[in-house]
């Protein structure tokens, strides 16, 4: 098995998927409805698996990114890097075990998502096998935002990103050449990644993300869509 | 091929502090999460904590305050400062490499041979 | 603070036999936990990962379940090699936590 440059293994399974290897549609999985004794999921609860959801999906692309290219072992990645105003958790955003402050973490987190979108827009014709699991994530992350603007106290000092800068970003990155196209692919990935893996840490830290029900799998299978708001 | 060695481990006075080290060879430190991990002689294993890609630490209730992890990714090494070490703190210390899927679930799928830190006067 | 409890502690057993050990967390973990594998003097070797999945090179003989908060680690068909001690590990939650590692068990030959 090999594993990539940020210890992903290639064998990695994906919950989301059902057994025909397709994406389960929101609501539609016979594993979720044939479970009455479960208890609604909260906000709180909503908002983990929503997350994981999207990191399987992040997976699923991470495959494909690293199988058609090398970048996932590329040195060359920090220069590339340079060039990519990517989100990123620091110590000052109150996210982290210390110095930990909820609502300028909550503020943080949301912010970030906002100022992703853009780059997941660029993702959405950059897959073959996995276009579909460009657009769930996409789409499964708007959602997720909308989840977490109705957890947060302070929606004021969130900031939007400028849709105009927003297309023209979009305009210059799809006018890379292709090594660089295959590389900001793999940045975005990488990136998302991290940055949703430190605002689970930081909600799961917020207290009230006790109890995630889940199949008799372990799986999370399915998608919180719009309707569920 | 991927190794982890660690080093620094040895006898220490009660009160003392010490410094473990732990080079990596074979991969890049900075992709991955990194954990270290304690065994005290014929005991099981004691987490103590983990330091995340995004530079992130979360301790052990236990290490909070005396314990500190930290990464040099220049020179592909992870340190564990001990301060105030005390007899119960005696135990192999090993680092350990983690690939994490969500938040927290570092599973730890490469581990060091380990060094011993003695906490005796 | 998530507690892990592993029973039994120790479990007396012949090659060939079915060895079953369970792991129980005091919440919730989803199926955030791992299995690993130590043999005395050696370091630890992960086994299985997100409750079920098996890390690389592990024997399929290993097999892991569960969900929530009881798991289980089976052993189809005990192997000489299979003599070691087995611990839990959950990954769901690591602030406000003493140990994310159960207490273990040791597997003995009969």
């Known amino acids: 098995d090999y594993k990539d440059h940020d210890g992903d293994y290639k064998d990695h399974d994906i919950d989301y998927k059902d057994d025909d290897d397709k994406l389960v549609p929101p609501g539609e999985d016979s594993k979720d409805v044939a479970a009455p004794h479960r208890q609604p999921l909260t906000s709180s609860e909503r908002i983990d698996k929503q997350i994981r959801y999207i990191l399987d999906g992040i997976s699923a692309l991470r495959k494909e990114t690293c199988n058609k290219s090398n970048m996932c072992e590329s040195s060359k990645e920090a220069l590339a890097e340079n060039n990519l105003n990517l989100p990123k958790m620091a110590e000052k955003d109150g996210c982290f075990q210390s110095g930990f402050n909820e609502e300028t973490c909550l503020v943080k987190i949301i912010t970030g998502l906002l100022e992703f979108e853009v780059y997941l827009e660029y993702l959405q014709n950059r897959f073959e096998s996995s276009e579909e699991q460009a657009r769930a994530v996409q789409m499964s992350t708007k959602v997720l935002i909308q989840f977490l603007q109705k957890k947060a106290k302070n929606l004021d000092a969130i900031t939007t990103p400028d849709p105009t800068t927003n297309a023209s970003l979009l305009t210059k990155l799809q006018a890379q050449n292709q090594w660089l196209q295959d590389m900001t692919t793999h940045l975005i990935l990488r990136s998302f990644k991290e940055f949703l893996q430190s605002s689970l840490r930081a909600l799961r830290q917020m207290g009230d993300l006790i109890s995630v029900p889940v199949d008799s799998r372990g799986s999370e299978q399915k998608l919180i869509s719009e309707e569920d708001l | 091929e991927v190794q982890l060695v660690e080093s620094g481990g040895g006898l220490v006075q009660p009160g003392g502090s010490l410094r473990l080290s732990c080079t990596v060879s074979g991969i890049d430190l900075s992709s991955y999460d990194m954990s270290w991990v304690r065994q005290a002689p014929g005991k099981g294993l004691e987490w103590v904590g983990y330091?995340?890609?995004?530079?992130?630490?979360y301790y052990a209730n236990w290490a909070k305050g005396r314990f500190t992890i930290s990464r040099d990714n220049s020179k592909n090494t992870l340190y564990l400062q001990m301060n105030s070490l005390r007899a119960e703190d005696t135990a192999v210390y090993y680092c350990?490499?983690?690939?994490?899927?969500?938040?927290?679930?570092?599973?730890?799928?490469?581990w060091g041979q380990g060094t011993l830190v003695t906490v005796s006067s | 603070d998530i507690q892990m409890t592993q029973s039994p502690s120790s479990v007396s057993a012949s090659v060939g036999d079915r060895v079953t050990i369970t792991c129980q967390a005091s919440?919730?973990?989803?199926?955030?936990l791992s299995w690993y594998q130590q043999k005395p003097g050696k370091a630890p070797k992960l086994l299985i990962y997100r409750t079920s999945t098996l890390a690389s090179g592990v024997p399929s003989r290993f097999s892991g379940s569960g969900s929530g908060t009881d798991f289980t680690l089976t052993i189809s068909s005990l192997q000489p090699e299979d003599f070691a001690t087995y611990y839990c590990?959950?990954?769901?939650?690591?602030?406000?936590?003493?140990?994310?590692f159960g207490g273990g068990t040791k597997v003995e030959i009969k």
């Open positions: 350990a490499r983690g690939s994490t899927d969500y938040a927290f679930d570092t599973r730890l799928d490469l």
């Open positions: 919440q919730s973990i989803s199926n955030e």
């Open positions: 590990q959950q990954g769901y939650n690591s602030n406000d936590v003493d140990n994310v």
């Open positions: 330091i995340y890609t995004d530079s992130s630490t």
